[in-house]
C-alpha cells in the first residue's frame, strides 16, 4: 500500500532509506534535454518473492532532439532547489541485498537519468535522519520514521531527533553509537493498526551500508 504523505521534516536534518520495501516505485526521470523512450517504463518497481527482491522494469532515456511526445518531467532549477530541502545527498545501499528480505537495494544508475530520484514509498518503509553539516544531533530516541497505516490513512512516525547548531555532524545508523532498542519505539495508539514495522530487521542491516552518488527525493 502506497504511503500517501511525506516523512516529517526535521529542522536542519535530512533523511534517506537504507533499502526499499517491495512495492516501492521509482520514477523514470530523465535529465534536461532527454526524455523517456517511447513506450518506456514510467516507474521501476521493487518486486520479489520470499528469497529475492529486485527492481522490475528498466528506465531508459533518449535525446529530446528526437520527436518528443512526452511532457518534460525534469524539475526546473527553482523547483529542484525547493524539493531538495528534505532529500538525501548520498543514499546508502546494502552491500548484501539478500540480508534484508523483501527489500531492494538502491537501483544502479541509468544513462542520462535526472539528477534526483523520486521514490514512492509503501507502508512499513523506514527512513533514517541525520543532521546536516554544521549541526549536532540531540537524540531523545530513534532517529528514524516509519510509514504506518491506521484506519486506512497513512502517516509517518515522528523521529526523535533535534539538530542543534554546533559544528559537529552526526552519522547514519552503523556509523554512530547505539540508540534506543526496537522495543523502545512508541507503539500504535489505536487498535486498528493494520501494518507492522520492520524496525529490528532494518537496524540489524544498517551496519552493512555504503554510500552511492545520488540525490534522492522521497514522495
Amino acid at each position: 500500500e502506497l504511503c500517501d504523505d511525506d516523512p516529517p521534516e526535521i529542522p536542519h536534518a535530512t533523511f534517506k532509506a537504507m533499502a526499499y520495501k517491495e512495492g516501492t516505485m521509482l520514477n523514470c526521470e530523465c535529465k534536461r534535454g532527454f526524455r523517456r523512450i517511447k513506450s518506456g517504463s514510467l516507474y521501476m518497481l521493487c518486486t520479489g518473492n520470499s528469497s529475492h527482491s529486485s527492481w522490475d522494469n528498466q528506465c531508459q532515456c533518449t535525446s529530446s532532439a528526437t520527436r518528443n511526445t512526452t511532457k518534460q518531467v525534469t524539475p526546473q532549477p527553482e523547483e529542484q532547489k525547493e524539493r531538495k530541502t528534505t532529500e538525501m545527498q548520498s543514499p546508502m545501499q546494502p552491500v548484501d541485498q539478500a540480508s534484508l528480505p523483501g527489500h531492494c537495494r538502491e537501483p544502479p544508475p541509468w544513462e542520462n537519468e535526472a539528477t534526483e530520484r523520486i521514490y514512492h514509498f509503501v507502508v512499513g518503509q523506514m527512513v533514517y535522519y541525520q543532521c546536516v553539516q554544521g549541526y549536532r544531533a540531540l537524540h531523545r530516541g530513534p532517529a528514524e520514521s516509519v510509514c504506518k497505516m491506521t484506519h486506512g490513512k497513512t502517516r509517518w512516525t515522528q523521529p526523535q531527533l533535534i539538530c542543534t547548531g554546533e559544528m559537529e555532524t552526526s552519522q547514519f545508523p552503523g556509523e554512530e553509537k547505539p540508540q534506543a532498542s526496537p522495543e523502545g519505539r512508541p507503539e500504535s495508539e489505536t487498535s486498528c493498526l493494520v501494518t507492522t514495522t520492520d524496525f529490528q530487521i532494518q537496524t540489524e542491516m544498517a551496519a552493512t551500508m555504503e554510500t552511492s552518488i545520488f540525490t534522492t527525493e522521497y514522495q
Epitope: E1, M25, E82, G152
Partner: antibody, heavy 116, light 106 residues
C-alpha cells in the same frame, strides 16, 4: 468538519481550457495530498493525479499527463485542476478527494461539458 | 497498470437478499478499498483495507479477500443500499478503480 467545496458546472467549447477549483476547510490543507478523479457520464471512476500542496509536487496518471495540470494555493487552501485542449470526450464530472490514504472526503463534483 | 474487474456489472436484488460483489485485480495487491456511489453524488468510502468498515457504515456490509480476489458482501440488502459500488486499489500507481457494480431493484 472537513469540507471540500468545488466550483460550479462549466460548459466549454472544444479546444478551450477550464480550471476547476476545490476549496478545503476543516483540516490542515498542507498535511494531505489532494487527488483528482473523473467520472464520464454513465462510466466509472478514473484517477487523474495528486498534488502535495506544501511543495507543489504533482504525480499524474499517464493517461492525463498532457490533459490535466494540478496546482494548489496554500494561502487560500484551494487546489485547482486545469484541463486543456478540451474535446467532447472530456465531458465528465471531476472530483477532488482528500488523500493521506483512502479517500475519506470528496468534493461534490464539478460537471464539465464540452460542446460546440 | 493494475486492472480491476468487478462482477457482476449489474445485480438485481430485493430487500433482505444477501448480495456479493467480487473484484479481481490483474496483479496481487495489499488491500482493497470499496466505495458506494448514489446518482448525482460523490463516492463515499465504505470499506478500507479489505475488511474494515468506514465510520458510520452499517455492520451488514463486510469485505474479505487477499492477493487478487476480493469480495464485498451485504448480508441483508436494505432500501438505502441500492447504489453503485466500486473497488479501488492504491498499492501502485496509477491508482485504479473497478468499473463498478450497480445494485438495482429486482
Amino acid at each position: 468538519q472537513v469540507q471540500l467545496v468545488q466550483s460550479g458546472a462549466e460548459v466549454k467549447k472544444p479546444g478551450s481550457s477550464v480550471k476547476v477549483s476545490c476549496k478545503a476547510s476543516g483540516y490542515t490543507f498542507t498535511s494531505y495530498r489532494m487527488h483528482w478523479v473523473r467520472q464520464a457520464p454513465g462510466q466509472g471512476l478514473e484517477w487523474i493525479g495528486y498534488i502535495r500542496p506544501k511543495k507543489g509536487y504533482t504525480e499524474y496518471n499517464q493517461k492525463f499527463k498532457d490533459k490535466a495540470t494540478i496546482t494548489a494555493d496554500e494561502s487560500t487552501n484551494t487546489a485547482y485542476m486545469e484541463l486543456s485542449s478540451l474535446r467532447s470526450e472530456d465531458t465528465a464530472v471531476y472530483y477532488c478527494a482528500r488523500g493521506g490514504g483512502v479517500f475519506d472526503y470528496w468534493g461534490q463534483g464539478t460537471l464539465v461539458t464540452v460542446s460546440s | 497498470d493494475i486492472q480491476m474487474t468487478q462482477s457482476p456489472s449489474t445485480l438485481s436484488a430485493s430487500v433482505g437478499d444477501r448480495v456479493t460483489i467480487t473484484c479481481s485485480a490483474s496483479s496481487s495487491i495489499s488491500y482493497m478499498h470499496w466505495y458506494q456511489q448514489k446518482p448525482g453524488k460523490a463516492p463515499k468510502l465504505l470499506i478500507y483495507t479489505t475488511s474494515n468498515l468506514a465510520s458510520g457504515v452499517p455492520a451488514r456490509f463486510s469485505g474479505s479477500g487477499s492477493g487478487t480476489e476480493f469480495t464485498l458482501t451485504i448480508s441483508s440488502l436494505q432500501p438505502d443500499d441500492f447504489a453503485t459500488y466500486y473497488c479501488h486499489q492504491r498499492s501502485t500507481y496509477p491508482l485504479t478503480f473497478g468499473q463498478g457494480t450497480k445494485v438495482e431493484v429486482k
